[in-house]
């Protein structure tokens, strides 16, 4: 446990609990130690959010949370003299922060972002139903790698949806993807309620399509070799190989978890290259192959976004219909 004796009486409440927002969605609470705390008390602070979530016991007089400010969030803080979780803390003091004002029906909805090939982020949204159709939107974004909040420049419209893309390139820094991108959409005139989103960089990643390098037949198998999209290592990807046979009109899809180029037939030591052997393919017929990839759960939280299909490549001969 913590240092010092643990007096039986409850500690006084913390003082000067205040809340502020940094960046777009980093909410920071700070407080001062209680006045008149027992002199032999080594102060620890117990805090939790309004719904009794995220309980924390720590000696710091500060707590932060990355949270989309679309609804009110409250922190309750109390002090105690030990790290003993069963010790009753002081009276809890609460401080809340509310989202920016505005008609909730005016806020944009369906604010979502996809990180394309770990190189640029594309966000889209639907206007709120109580919004003037000529609303001029602006999207702001922030990531730990940026010194300041940035504004997304090129807003476009596709159907009823609006969108904007901005460069976000994965850097070699190992902690880069442990941080999220904070997003806010509002309008220039300040008439609509701003909308916020936090995009973890380990989710909503859509790789570029792979590039088929080589197709060859060996002992009744079709050997497929392809180059993975830049920025991804092969063990972080899951693959789908589709083979269409023009004669039998069969359409086979193979799910591939590991695609190592171990066979001697494959070109070896080619960086970022993956391979797969499709069994039982007739070499005297035309076979058309295409491949797509998605991130896997080994490296990413999300495994739902497939890349587009690669360009097709064919091998074999189309039989004359006699």
């Amino acid at each position: 446990g913590g240092g010092g004796a643990a007096p039986t009486e409850t500690q006084p409440p913390v003082t000067n609990l205040s809340v502020s927002v940094e960046n777009l969605c980093t909410v920071i609470w700070t407080w001062n130690p209680p006045e008149g705390a027992s002199p032999n008390c080594s102060l620890w602070y117990f805090s939790h959010f309004g719904d009794k979530q995220d309980k924390k016991l720590a000696p710091e007089t500060r707590r932060s949370k990355e949270v989309p400010l679309n609804e009110k969030i409250c922190l309750q803080v109390g002090s105690q003299c030990s790290t003993n979780e069963s010790e009753k803390p002081s009276i809890l003091v609460e401080k809340c922060i509310s989202p920016p004002e505005g008609d909730p029906e005016s806020a944009v909805t369906e604010l979502q972002c996809i990180w394309h090939n770990l190189s640029y982020m594309q966000c889209s949204w639907l206007p709120g139903r109580n919004t003037s159709p000529d609303t001029n939107y602006t999207l702001y974004y922030w990531h730990r790698s940026l010194e300041k909040i940035r504004q997304c420049e090129e807003i476009y419209k596709e159907g009823q949806y609006f969108g904007c893309s901005f460069d976000l390139t994965k850097v070699k820094d190992s902690s880069f993807e442990q941080h999220s991108v904070q997003i806010m959409v509002k309008d220039y005139a300040g008439k609509i309620k701003p909308s916020f989103n936090i995009v973890p960089l380990t989710s909503r990643v859509k790789p570029d399509p792979p590039h088929i390098k080589n197709l060859s037949f060996h002992n009744g198998d079709l050997h497929v070799q392809w180059e993975n999209p830049q920025n991804f290592i092969s063990r972080c990807l899951f693959y789908e190989v589709e083979v269409n046979n023009s004669q039998t009109e069969t359409h086979n899809v193979f799910s591939v978890q590991e695609a190592k180029c171990q066979n001697p037939e494959f070109e070896r030591n080619v960086e970022n290259t993956s391979c797969f052997m499709v069994p039982g393919v007739l070499p005297d017929t035309l076979n058309t192959v295409r491949i797509r990839v998605k991130t896997n759960k080994l490296c990413y939280e999300d495994d739902k976004l497939w890349s587009n299909w690669s360009q097709e490549m064919s091998i074999g001969k189309k039989r004359n219909s006699t």
Epitope: T109, E110, P133
Partner: antibody
Framework: EVQVLDSGGGLVQPGGSLRLSCTAS????????MSWVRQTPGRGLEWVSG????????YFADSVKGRFTISRDNSKNTVYLQMNSLRAEDTAVYYC???????????WGQGTLVIVSS | DIQMTQSPSSLSASVGDRVTITCRAS??????LAWYQQKPEKAPKSLIY???SLQSGVPSRFSGSGSGTDFTLTISSLQPEDFATYYC?????????FGQGTKLEIK
């Protein structure tokens, strides 16, 4: 050319249920909200419900909230209106309509008649 | 909800006439108004959106004007196929609401 086809109307008893379907073509279906609008001789045209292109957002008139649900299958270019706890006042011709770039209706289905009567 | 009131509720006119139908909103709706034409036993058809923008494929004899609370639909020279019921609809705020209709009949 944009086409909208609605179906599924019929005669149903008060308290009963009915599911209307709407299939559309000729535009990028997933990018547009689809709505249902009904018409009666007494009340004229009345917007009933809508669903955003992704299906993530749904909207309802107060008169049907809690009784009607709307869904869509973008792989089939189809929208569904599930009508439960039907009342006599729900009797109307129901039109499926594609929204334009905002909440006006630039293409309409031919309409399907729903009669709620015992 | 915003109330939309059309006038007149019915109107008799002859082929070649210039006809004006008006629509009033219970509160300002900027220019976010649409007009529809409906023939008996048929679905409504979009004519105009954003108060004055003609839907593609709609003849240029149809025009719309107005902003705020007062709007008009004008048919510059009536054709036989124009005899129908016309509706206005606001989309400035949710839910979208329609006028009660103006029936245009042959004199």
């Amino acid at each position: 050319e944009v086409q909208v086809l609605d179906s599924g109307g019929g005669l149903v008893q008060p308290g009963g249920s009915l599911r209307l379907s709407c299939t559309a073509s000729g535009f990028t279906f997933r990018l547009y909200t689809m709505s249902w609008v009904r018409q009666t001789p007494g009340r004229g045209l009345e917007w009933v419900s809508g669903i955003s292109g992704s299906g993530l957002s749904t909207y309802f008139a107060d008169s049907v909230k809690g009784r009607f649900t709307i869904s869509r299958d973008n792989s089939k270019n189809t929208v569904y209106l599930q009508m439960n706890s039907l009342r006599a006042e729900d009797t109307a011709v129901y039109y499926c309509a594609k929204e334009g770039d905002w909440i006006y209706f630039d293409s309409w289905g031919q309409g399907t008649l729903v009669i709620v009567s015992s | 909800d915003i109330q939309m009131t059309q006038s007149p509720s019915s109107l008799s006119a002859s082929v070649g006439d210039r006809v004006t139908i008006t629509c009033r909103a219970s509160q300002g709706i900027s220019s976010w108004l649409a007009w529809y034409q409906q023939k008996p036993e048929k679905a409504p058809k979009s004519l105009i959106y954003a108060a004055s923008s003609l839907q593609s494929g709609v003849p240029s004899r149809f025009s719309g004007s107005g902003s705020g609370t007062d709007f008009t639909l004008t048919i510059s020279s009536l054709q036989p196929e124009d005899f129908a019921t016309y509706y206005c609809q606001q989309y400035n705020s949710h839910p979208p609401t329609f006028g009660q209709g103006t029936k245009l009949e042959i004199k």
